[in-house]
């Protein structure tokens, strides 16, 4: 089944996250080894009644630079994202289509490794390798060397001179003309092709389609996402740019969000969908202006890529134990206390019980339950749509999302839940009755 529809054309892109070591880590922990976004794939619209083809995917090599030594063992997360290109308010919408993860052992400098991962109805085929940037060599990129012809012992920028090998290892020589991007060799003189490429020198694409294919009786799985086309040696284009030769040099075709001779300059805008986990992108209509990601509750970072360690803020009162469940924060209260943050003494509400983290609130001699997000009813025992509680203040529009909810604020308001007016009109220096409320404002509003 295609992730796109005739009503909403879409295109796909990938996010790759690398972490060191073999430990099983949560998807939201930092991508300590590095992370990268691919270019957008071609626009695709499903044709009603037509069989589902292989989906058009982003082309080009996706490079994830790592600063320190290559750890040898690493974990990876590859997310396939769908960008819907309809006329929805606020621009394109992004949603996570599939996420695959794994743990691998890989030495730097080795050949391309192939992998197949499945996520639900989707199958992702990809190739990967770790490569040292000169003058680093070795399986961890920790040794420095000089070419056999180099007279000086210190490369430019190396101060003081690091311990250098006397000579670099002689490189493995593949068959003459073997494509440096689509072929590799493990024995001198051979030319073995990456997934999706063929021919004696691995220069012929098997198919122009690629490797994210729905599995099932009608699925065709020829072709795969592989390093991009172009005869440039070593692909000098960074950040997923594709390289083509020119009469004098080379030319990089940069993915959206990057520019410069080698696509090394980031100019990410909201159109590139830089905000993860349902973050709302604001500003950045052109590459020279910055964008800001307004993160939904529970996420932080310039791209909403990090989950907040909300327990570090010690939100639970009266000795309550904090539990960050990912989708929600829970406080396990000591006996005699209740509420989302254990802030209410149960005696205050005369033993009134509110389920699912709801809080008993006193008022005018009566008691009621203020329910946690996602629950409703008299005692908070009924499941509710996260937007049903109207969590967005001041007329903000609520959108349910896979990671929770997002508030789209009305003009003049901001904040994760639109709770802050940018310019409160008619504000005066002294409050009027009732105390603490701004004069002229309604006493309660959504």
């Amino acid at each position: 089944r295609s992730p796109c529809s005739a009503r909403l054309p879409c295109r796909l892109f990938f996010r790759v996250c690398l972490k060191p070591g073999l430990s099983e880590e949560a998807a939201e922990s930092p991508c300590a080894l590095g992370a990268a976004l691919s270019a957008r794939g071609p626009v695709y619209t499903e044709q009603p009644g037509a069989p589902a083809p292989d989906l058009p995917l982003p082309d080009g090599l996706l490079q994830v630079p790592f600063r320190d030594a290559w750890p040898g063992t690493f974990s990876f997360i590859i997310e396939t994202w769908r960008e819907e290109l309809g006329d929805q308010i606020g621009g394109p919408a992004w949603s996570l289509l599939a996420r695959v993860a794994g743990r691998r052992r890989l030495a730097a400098g080795g050949p391309w490794a192939r992998d197949i991962q499945r996520a639900g109805a989707w199958e992702l085929r990809f190739s990967y390798r770790a490569r040292c940037e000169p003058p680093a060599v070795g399986t961890a990129c920790t040794r420095l060397c000089r070419p056999r012809s180099a007279p000086s012992r210190c490369g430019p920028g190396l101060r003081p001179c690091a311990p250098l090998e006397d000579e670099c290892e002689a490189p493995l020589v593949c068959r003459a003309g073997c494509s440096p991007e689509h072929g590799f060799c493990e024995q001198p003189g051979e030319c073995r092709c990456l997934e999706g490429w063929t021919g004696p020198l691995c220069t012929v694409p098997v198919s122009t389609s690629s490797c994210l294919s729905p599995r099932g009786p009608s699925s065709a799985t020829t072709g795969c996402l592989v390093p991009g086309p172009g005869p440039c040696d070593g692909n000098p284009c960074a950040n997923g740019g594709s390289c083509s030769e020119t009469p004098r040099s080379f030319e990089c075709t940069c993915p959206r969000g990057f520019y410069g001779l080698r696509c090394e300059v980031s100019g990410v805008t909201c159109a590139d969908g830089p905000c993860f986990n349902g973050g709302l992108c604001v500003g950045g209509a052109d590459p020279d202006s910055a964008y800001i990601c307004h993160c939904p509750p529970g996420f932080q970072g310039s791209n909403c890529e990090k989950r907040v360690d909300r327990c570090s803020l010690q939100p639970c009162r009266n000795g309550g134990l904090c539990l960050d469940l990912g989708h929600a924060l829970r406080c396990r209260c000591r006996a005699g206390f209740a509420g989302p943050r254990c802030e209410h003494d149960l005696d205050d509400c005369a033993g009134r019980a509110c389920a699912n983290g709801g809080t008993c609130v006193e008022g005018g001699g009566a008691h009621r339950c203020s329910c946690a997000l996602g629950f409703g009813g008299r005692d908070c025992r009924e499941r509710a749509d996260p937007c049903a509680a109207r969590p967005c203040a001041h007329g903000g529009r609520c959108y349910a999302h896979f990671s929770g909810l997002v508030c789209a604020c009305a003009p003049g308001y901001m904040g994760a839940r639109c709770e802050f007016p940018v310019h409160p009109d008619g504000a005066s220096a002294l409050p009027a009755a009732p105390p603490g409320l701004r004069p002229g404002d309604p006493q309660r509003y959504l």
């Epitope: 307004h294 993160c295 509750p297 529970g298 932080q300 907040v308 909300r310 803020l313 939100p315 009162r317 509420g339 989302p340 943050r341 802030e343 809080t359 609130v361 006193e362 203020s370 203040a393 904040g415 994760a416 839940r417 709770e419 802050f420 603490g436 409320l437 701004r438 404002d441 006493q443 309660r444 509003y445 959504l446």
Partner: nanobody, 117 residues
Amino acid sequence: QVQLQESGGGLVVAGGSLRLSCAASGSSVSFLSMAWYRQAPGKKRELVAGISTDGSTNYADSVKGRFTISEDNAKNTVDLQMNSLQPEDTAVYYCYAYRWIDRYTYWGQGTQVTVSS
């Protein structure tokens, strides 16, 4: 009912620093999103910085990189650390709270900040 009490205002030379503090007291103070606003003479009151119940923050463009808002849940306070102050930062600074239980808006009395050149 929630009461807000600001402190920390005063006179400072341009380039200097001040730390404003706002203490919230009363009922259900843990359900507050809090912010700092300011109002210069003859101008509208404007948002300076806000912090939501999930800890996410918002800043006015004019103070980004200079001001930092933070909260101490245990003490029910929200602080505004103001560095590299400029004469145009002179204003009365108000503490603001939005209580989610009943969606009431609360304001403090304000504290004067004067930056001299």
